[in-house]
């Protein structure tokens, strides 16, 4: 029988019982919060061999072992995971080892076993055998090893049962618990699973299987199960489901939820039976099962129910993510925040239509309007009194409507009303008018020419670049020395510059008025040769990287005919040049025959240029007689590799567990104080613990239904 | 031929427990979501009961907790078990393949009565 | 859950008349409105689907509209055996409801 869409165990351990005529869970498995500790021999759930997405165990009091419980769990698919994990166990206080003795396989996703003060037989089992990438596993705070005296079944008569393999150089027995060992299949068998009797599986087999070589004989399937078999891929008129089955068109119109409507339902795309239309898709109607791409950013209609939305904050900003039209009033009023036109712009970057009126007033905050990216339609069915659709007031640090060069916005109906924006240039509001169309339509008192613009340089004139060099990690540029009518009045230049990997970057990206700004700036002082072209040396850059660079002049705030003179560059574009990749990463090497290695690596993170190929170097090396003195058949500790200087011999000296060998010395010495990059790593570390618990307590504590 | 055949009603006391059988035929049961509908003596219907292709469930206010809606794909068979009966849980049951948006046709048993009565 | 109401309760007409019957919904349920008639004795018998869909051997006397809130099912020439009680019901969200009914008699 297939459970699903998701099982949630909590409080009763009887609800354990929901799962007892279960073969595959279709979703997660939770079972947590059982506070009083219970007898749990008496519950056993032979037929569960799959889960589909992630199994969470969290303080469930009593609990000594998982093996009991699911004898015969042989797959976590990881379709969905929690937190990037296909199994956490977590603050299980009496839990003494995972005994899940038949688990072959976790698809995607890695574990997370963390302060299970009584958990043993962790170091016993390869997880490498289990998972794909070991390197994402976090295993900390359980039970020391060192008090756990793990011991796989048949070590004490010396009759090792199970099967050896290396971790971290250690070549030991492997088992999950004191009777049950890890089970590996024949190396012949290569990636394929293999039955209990060390049979070879069929290729489309994962885990295990009943017979050999029989694609319905598996225990879960590679790809996906159809109609008791597993197949490679979906035979027509079937579609992929939660990662693992095909099911049919009447299958996919049947799954119901309880918070969507009918017509919400489940839709088929790419071959796919899937909850809702994945990005930048649309459904095909109302009542359809299929999906269409949009034409630019998916359609998402939002309604305000008193009719205004007051964006106050960026919480408020945060109920607008994902709209494109905005059913209702806008009503902009941000007066402080941190980081506040990259945090609007997450949340309202994607608006596309108002259909009532915009109203931005005390929003000292803001620099520029750029944050409403998308913003092309004020509909102005509403109107605030005096009939305007567009209502600018009071924002003292208001420099930039929009850059109209990239902007279409039109104002359907509806004046606009510009006061006290001391720093808005007269100019751009008339070049708003152009551009909305709703020239001729407002008085003279509605745009107000002494009180916009009052503090800005609002008569620009333009600096010119004259030279520009570049290394892999320096510019230099130089530009032409401007002179303002009166010389006095020039203080210096502030260079401004930032990557931008595209071209489309404007001077008020990022930028908001409580010292947030995506730009670096530079102050460049006038130099004191009146012939000589200013200039500036940016360094510290990235290699083969693109920047967006522009000039500034400071000048006095002179008033002539109420404006201020100024003058700053275009935005010039400029890359850096190439230099040496960093180191590729993951160099992984294993032999598979006598004369062959296979060398396998990832890019570099820092590949500092376009890479056109790859230089792979190899030596012999001689065989090492210190893998020759010592018995590796004795249970006795492995000693420590250390080449050492002659003097002191290294066993003695691991035999002090209070000291290490440190730096160069010659003997016991005191721990190595520990390193900034190690202090920082544990600093991170220690964050990214309490980052996964409150996502863990957020995720699981919910309020109990009335 | 789609068919939604009933079994399992009957007289129980109030406390008391009954479980009711649909087997379908003639379409495939397993990619259906399966509703149980009632009628008391003289009232209107009353829907109380689904279960999705997942096996998801979904149930009335009125029965919540007290029944459970099963299926069994292997059988083609759709389950109601009813526990902590009252009277008036007094009604003719319908099990139904209702449609939806997609598949419109809806399909009903020919009911089965439960007398909930000391 | 979303409550549907029926009006009238009780419809008295004569044959070869038309009928409407009224179905309204607390909340918006889109087109996801389903009408069935019923006779004694025997189960419901879908007559519309959403609304305004009709169904292969329900005869075309029988109409639906309306989309929202406020839905009407047609009976545009009443025939003898259309005198039944006729339930409304919406499928747009669970719990799924149906309305009380409506009678419709001869007069």
């Known amino acids: 029988e297939i459970c699903g869409p998701g099982i949630d165990i909590r409080n009763d351990y009887q609800q354990l019982k929901r799962l007892e005529n279960c073969t595959v869970i279709e979703g997660y498995l939770h079972i947590l919060l059982i506070s009083k500790a219970e007898d749990y021999r008496s519950y056993r759930f032979p037929k569960l061999t799959v889960i589909t997405e992630y199994l969470l165990l969290f303080r469930v009091a009593g609990l000594e072992s998982l093996g009991d419980l699911f004898p015969n769990l042989t797959v976590i698919r990881g379709w969905k995971l929690f937190y990037n994990y296909a199994l956490v166990i977590f603050e299980m206080t009496n839990l003494k080892d995972i005994g899940l003795y038949n688990l072959r396989n976790i698809t995607r996703g890695a574990i997370r076993i963390e302060k299970n003060a009584d958990l043993c037989y962790l170091s016993t089992v390869d997880w490498s055998l289990i998972l794909d990438a070991v390197s994402n596993n976090y295993i900390v705070g359980n039970k020391p090893p060192k008090e756990c005296g793990d011991l796989c079944p048949g070590t004490m008569e010396e009759k090792p049962m199970c099967e050896k393999t290396t971790i971290n150089n250690e070549y030991n027995y492997r088992c999950w618990t004191t009777n049950r060992c890890q089970k590996m299949c024949p190396s012949t068998c290569g990636k394929r699973a293999c039955t209990e009797n060390n049979e070879c599986c069929h290729p489309e087999c994962l885990g295990s299987c009943s017979a050999p070589d029989n694609d319905t004989a598996c225990v879960a399937c590679r790809h996906y199960y159809y109609a008791g078999v597993c197949v490679p891929a979906c035979p027509p008129n079937t579609y992929r489901f939660e990662g693992w089955r095909c099911v049919d068109r009447d299958f996919c119109a049947n799954i119901l939820s309880a918070e969507s409507s009918d017509s919400e339902g489940f839709v088929i795309h790419d071959g796919e039976c899937m909850q809702e239309c994945p990005s930048g898709f649309i459904r095909n109607g109302s009542q359809s099962m299929y999906c269409i791409p949009c034409e630019g950013p998916c359609p998402k209609v939002c309604e305000e129910e008193k009719k205004t939305k007051t964006i106050d904050s960026v919480t408020s900003a945060q109920m607008l993510q994902g709209c494109t039209i905005f059913k209702g009033n806008l009503l902009i009023n941000i007066r402080r925040g941190n980081n506040i036109a990259s945090e609007l712009e997450n949340f309202m970057g994607l608006i596309e239509v108002v259909t009532g009126y915009v109203k931005i007033r005390h929003s000292h905050a803001l620099v520029s309007l750029s944050f409403l990216k998308n913003l092309r339609l004020i509909l102005g069915e509403e109107q605030l009194e005096g009939n305007y659709s567009f209502y600018v007031l009071d924002n003292q640090n208001l420099q930039q409507l929009w850059d109209w060069d990239h902007r279409n916005l039109t104002i359907k109906a509806g004046k606009m009303y510009f006061a006290f924006n001391p720093k808005l240039c007269v100019s751009e509001i008339y070049r708003m008018e152009e551009v909305t169309g709703t020239k001729g339509r407002q008085s003279k008192g509605d745009i107000n020419t002494r009180n916009n613009g009052e503090r800005a340089s609002c008569e620009s004139d333009v600096l010119h670049f004259t030279s520009t060099t570049t290394s892999k990690n320096r510019i230099i540029i130089t530009w032409h020395r401007y002179r303002p009518p009166d010389y006095r009045d020039l203080i210096s230049f502030t260079v401004y510059y930032k990557e931008a990997p595209f071209k489309n970057v404007t001077e008020y990206d990022g930028q908001d008025a409580c010292g947030s700004n995506s730009w670096n700036m530079v102050d460049v002082d006038l130099p004191p040769n009146k012939d000589v072209e200013p200039g500036i040396l940016l360094h510290g850059l990235k290699p083969w990287t693109q920047y967006a660079v522009y000039v500034k002049a400071v000048t006095l705030t002179m008033v002539e005919n109420d404006h201020i003179r100024g003058a700053k560059s275009e935005i010039l574009y400029i890359r850096t040049n190439a230099s040496v990749p960093s180191i590729p990463l993951d160099v992984l090497s294993a032999s598979n025959s006598s004369s062959q290695l296979i060398v396998k690596w990832n890019p570099p993170s820092l590949p500092n240029g376009n890479l056109s190929y790859y230089i792979v170097r190899w030596q012999r090396q001689p065989q090492d007689g210190y893998l020759y003195r010592h018995n590796y058949c004795s249970k006795d500790k492995i000693p420590i590799r250390k080449y050492a200087d002659g003097t002191i011999d290294i066993e003695e000296v691991t035999e002090n567990p209070k000291t290490e060998v440190c730096g160069g010395e010659k003997g016991p010495c005191c721990a190595c104080p520990k390193t900034e990059a190690e202090k920082q790593a544990e600093k991170e570390e220690a964050e990214y613990r309490k980052v996964f618990e409150n996502f863990l307590h957020n995720s699981i504590f919910v309020p109990r239904p009335e | 031929e789609v068919q939604l055949v009933q079994s399992g009603g009957g007289l129980v006391k109030p406390g008391g427990s009954l479980r009711l059988s649909c087997a379908a035929s003639?379409?495939?049961?397993?990619?259906?979501?399966m509703h149980w509908v009632r009628q008391a003596p003289g009232k209107g219907l009353e829907w109380i009961s689904v279960?999705?292709?997942?096996?998801?469930?979904y149930y009335a206010d009125s029965v919540k907790g007290r029944f459970t809606i099963s299926r069994d794909n292997a059988k083609n068979s759709l389950y109601l078990q009813m526990n902590s009966l009252r009277a008036e849980d007094t009604a003719v049951y319908y099990c139904?393949?209702?449609?939806?948006?997609?598949?419109?046709?809806?399909?009903w048993g020919q009911g089965t009565t439960v007398t909930v009565s000391s | 859950e979303i409550v549907l109401t029926q009006s009238p309760g009780t419809l008295s007409v004569s044959p070869g008349e038309r009928a409407t019957l009224s179905c309204r919904a607390s909340?918006?349920?889109?087109?996801?409105l389903h009408w069935y008639q019923q006779k004694p004795g025997q189960a419901p018998r879908l007559l519309i689907k959403?609304?305004?869909q009709s169904l292969s051997g329900i005869p075309d006397r029988f109409s639906g509209s309306g989309s929202g809130t406020d839905f009407t099912l047609t009976i545009s020439r009443l025939e003898p055996e259309d005198f039944a009680v006729y339930y409304c019901?919406?499928?747009?969200?669970?719990?799924?409801?149906f309305g009380q009914g409506t009678k419709v008699e001869i007069k």
């Open positions: 139904a393949r209702l449609g939806n948006f997609y598949y419109g046709m809806h399909v």
């Open positions: 909340q918006s349920i889109g087109s996801s």
């Open positions: 003639g379409f495939t049961f397993s990619s259906f979501a």
């Open positions: 279960i999705d292709t997942r096996g998801a469930t």
């Open positions: 019901h919406q499928s747009s969200r669970l719990p799924h409801t």
């Open positions: 959403y609304a305004s």
